[in-house]
Interface confidence: medium
Amino acid sequence: SKSSWGLENEALIVRCPQRGRSTYPVEWYYSDTNESIPTQKRNRIFVSRDRLKFLPARVEDSGIYACVIRSPNLNKTGYLNVTIHKKPPSCNIPDYLMYSTVRGSDKNFKITCPTIDLYNWTAPVQWFKNCKALQEPRFRAHRSYLFIDNVTHDDEGDYTCQFTHAENGTNYIVTATRSFTVEEKGFSMFPVITNPPYNHTMEVEIGKPASIACSACFGKGSHFLADVLWQINKTVVGNFGEARIQEEEGRNESSSNDMDCLTSVLRITGVTEKDLSLEYDCLALNLHGMIRHTIRLRRKQPIDHR
């Protein structure tokens, strides 16, 4: 299911994830009760064409919503996980409220206000960087964009757009935030672990060797202070004190989707019962920050030959 989020007391409008280019009618339901959501605008939550509108949204609206597209030969159902958050008390916008990061390499760059096309908004859109209103002439708001002239690394940060959605004579505030980072010709970015998947469980056989590869990508070109490593129960492998478990010397370099990646391999010479209770963390880090994927081991189930 797809995810959408909004802030308490703001407007939130979402689209049916199954929509595609369909022009057929869309019905919305509360997934847990199967109760149909009305189209009457007098309701705080109502359906308008393929869209579900929360005017305004409340924390208790959080949940899974189902949308059904009814066409003559096929009904398509989509699910949308909606989370309404309380407004953050401080300026630090948590990751779960951030839209995709924008990466700029041009001297003049534009940032698009996320989700704005879903709303009935009127200019101007107000823009803030790290919660401060942008008033320098280098920053120009035009339609749903923020244009930045003479971009430098100092322009990196979290940019919030704020606009008004009008419905039935009432105005509702909407805010959306995304990060902006400046790229070089090549670019360095927050690490992305490509393997193992997040919260992965790997099957192993007691007494047999096991190896787990951790791969992460860091951008293209510069990978200053980029590293991939393993921790066991939050301790660096070398300090864990278990000779059977070793991290391979060196890092294998590779390319994936035109990005530079590193791989570190964790080897267990003979898996024991005790190893199944340990937490293995794959860490990828560079100047932008650190990310970790935790994996656990579980005993491989014997194949039943009956």
């Epitope: 430098t152 690394h153 650190m290």
Partner: antibody, heavy 117, light 107 residues
Framework: EVQLLESGGGLVQPGGSLRLSCAAS????????MSWVRQAPGKGLEWVSV???????FYADSVKGRFTISRDNSKNTLYLQMNSLRAEDTAVYYC???????????WGQGTLVTVSS | DIQMTQSPSSLSASVGDRVTITCRAS??????LAWYQQKPGKAPKLLIY???SLQSGVPSRFSGSGSGTDFTLTISSLQPEDFATYYC?????????FGQGTKVEIK
């Protein structure tokens, strides 16, 4: 205000050991990449080692296998354990934080290490 | 390792002069370059990072430019407190490496 304060330098014989400390304050130490940079008398700057709180470490080839960088985030302190010291390790050792764009944005005042018999 | 070469190794200038120091990298380093000022007996001080971004608190008479392999530090109007040694440093790849330094002396 960001402050870095090195200590532990002194005179040591070739082959000897020394442990440098760097007390940090005024910033989120546990999230920072921290580094040691040295400067031999009358010479230029030479990077020595760097550490991340996740446990990642890097060393200059000239000190690999002899020096160990570590940190104690609960004490906001960076360390450099120097073993098998040589005359060419004589230098002022600076502790520095790595900031935006990979520059060393804050430096300590330095501590002098002299390796001589 | 990436080699960083500064020129000149020293220069004499007067207060009010425009001073330019260059730094060349042995390979393309994009904009991953920093400039430092160091006075005798003191720790280095970061002036410029990412080739052209002025570090907070540094006077605007200092500016950096360039990308790829060739970089320049410019002091638009030299002040008495600017007489010092200047270093460039690349942070494109590990290990970070410094130029050999440029000493700016009073003419």
């Amino acid at each position: 205000e960001v402050q870095l304060l090195e200590s532990g330098g002194g005179l040591v014989q070739p082959g000897g050991s020394l442990r440098l400390s760097c007390a940090a304050s005024g910033f989120s130490f546990s999230h920072a990449w921290m580094s040691w940079v040295r400067q031999a008398p009358g010479k230029g700057l030479e990077w020595v080692s760097v550490i991340h709180s996740g446990g990642s470490t890097f060393y200059a080839d000239s000190v690999k296998g002899r020096f160990t960088i570590s940190r104690d985030n609960s004490k906001n302190t960076l360390y450099l354990q120097m073993n098998s010291l040589r005359a060419e390790d004589t230098a002022v050792y600076y502790c520095a934080r790595i900031g935006k764009g990979g520059g060393f944005d804050y430096w300590g005042q330095g501590t002098l290490v002299t390796v001589s018999s | 390792d990436i080699q960083m070469t500064q020129s000149p190794s020293s220069l004499s200038a007067s207060v009010g002069d425009r001073v330019t120091i260059t730094c060349r990298a042995s390979q393309d380093i994009g904009s991953w370059l920093a400039w430092y000022q160091q006075k005798p007996g003191k720790a280095p001080k970061l002036l410029i990072y990412a080739a052209s971004s002025l570090q907070s608190g540094v006077p605007s008479r200092f500016s950096g430019s360039g990308s790829g392999t060739d970089f320049t530090l410019t002091i638009s109007s030299l002040q008495p407190e600017d007489f010092a040694t200047y270093y460039c440093q690349q942070s494109y790849s590990t290990p970070p490496t410094f130029g050999q330094g440029t000493k700016v002396e009073i003419k």
